[in-house]
């Protein structure tokens, strides 16, 4: 049993039980993000509000397959991205050595049973280092002014709502803020314990071949949820080939 399986199982625990028979889940993503050329960025999605089992997560950029995390099999990184893409954290994907050409839409495609496929979209803008620095110098005072204005407006709105709605509470929920906190803390995406072998996990007959369409609709079933809890850590060993 493997690491990705544990992550998927843990995600399953967090999902609220809802009526089955229709696609009730929602994908939360980090939304629109920007990063500097040469840097790294974590792409992160989170499926919630469904009890469906996540069997596979595909990461795609426009029409190109970047990586697959399969509950049965593990990670497969597309050969053309193998030097710049790292699996994780969790079911996410880390893009390294960013270039301006990496700017664009990225999709996390969750294959689930019995719901089917959920897709999340992230837009990444890769900025030239100088542009990012130059932009930051001028944006700081502007952002400060904007923030102050927003605080005033928000306060006024809250007062008005409070007065008009009397004692009805106003709930403000920021998906992006949640995801950033989760990502920073990691515990939402990956336990802090040493990783057992197989973040996500193995084998031959999954999608990602030589020719043809880059989107695989078939994916393996998630099996044996609970055995993963007894999976032993390997300790501090270097890369090896599993023989059994």
């Amino acid at each position: 049993m493997r690491w990705c399986l544990l992550l998927i199982w843990a995600q399953g625990l967090r999902q609220a039980p809802l009526a089955s028979g229709m696609m009730t889940g929602t994908i939360e993503t980090t939304g629109n993000i920007s990063a500097e050329k040469g840097g790294s960025i974590i792409l992160q999605c989170h499926l919630s509000s469904t009890t469906a089992q996540v069997t596979q997560v595909n990461w795609e950029q426009q029409d190109q397959l970047l990586a697959i995390c399969n509950a049965d099999l593990g990670w497969h990184i597309s050969p053309s991205f193998k030097d710049r893409v790292a699996p994780g954290p969790g079911l996410g994907l880390t893009l390294q050595s960013l270039t301006v050409n990496d700017t664009g839409e990225y999709f996390c495609i969750y294959h689930t049973y019995p719901d089917g496929t959920y897709t999340g979209r992230i837009f990444l803008e890769v900025l030239e280092s100088s542009v990012a620095e130059h932009g930051a110098r001028f944006q700081i005072p502007l952002l400060g002014a904007m923030a102050a204005t927003l605080v005033v407006i928000c306060t006024a709105v809250i007062v008005v709502v409070a007065l008009t709605r009397k004692k009805k509470a106003l709930r403000i929920h920021s998906v992006e803020g949640d995801l950033r906190r989760k990502s920073a803390g990691q515990e939402e995406w990956s336990p802090s314990a040493p990783s057992p072998p197989g973040s996500c996990v193995q084998a031959e007959a999954a999608p990602a071949g030589l020719c043809g369409e880059q989107r695989g609709e078939d994916c393996a079933e998630l099996h044996d949820y609970f055995n993963v809890l007894s999976y032993r850590s390997l300790g501090n060993c270097s890369f090896f080939t599993e023989t059994g």
Epitope: H76, S195, P197, G198, Q202, A206, C211, R215, E221, E242
Partner: antibody, heavy 127, light 110 residues
Amino acid sequence: EVQLLESGGGLVQPGGSLRLSCAASGFTFSNYAMSWVRQAPGKGLEWVSAIYPGGGSIYYADSVKGRFTISRDNSKNTLYLQMNSLRAEDTAVYYCAKAIRTCSLSHCYYYYGMDVWGQGTLVTVSS
Amino acid sequence: QSVLTQPPSASGTPGQRVTISCSCSSSNIGNNAVSWYQQLPGTAPKLLIYYDSNRPSGVPDRFSGSKSGTSASLAISGLRSEDEADYYCGSWDYSLSAYVFGGGTKLTVL
């Protein structure tokens, strides 16, 4: 030593059935996807079917869809291929093969290829 | 007809370097993983290369895999008589949901 041993081949009439078995040893069978690949006399390799470790995701070549059924018994470390409605063109040596996986401390990666093959079993469909 | 196209035959003299190509008849080969297999006469196939260019343990470094554009290649340097065999490329095909093999290349050592 990692080994795959096929059995169950033989002579069968067109329209008949046959069940091939592949006994695996030397590795944790339940962790790996497995495939059947065949080779007609004097011809090239033709992939037939594959099954994921848990047995829930299965793939078939168009030429055998609806006639062949792949299955596995992880408790017996055995892969099966049930072949029904056999045709003369199904005559071939049938190999079972194990998928590739490598693991690091934190991740296992799967690749597209078969790193261990059995010796093959001959299936002849003829009247 | 196979989705992967290989030359039916190739030849070389001992010590020479030979290259066998495997081209994709449809989309770009770049995003997909190629494996290479050797089949000596009367034996089961053996994996030579996986994930485009990786050699399993036990495969001599005379064998190497590469990929460029719409074609993958298997190179054999320092050719030996025991390299005389059939060579197949293979890959998973998304559109077919199937593993596909090239038609095979018969290598003759002159």
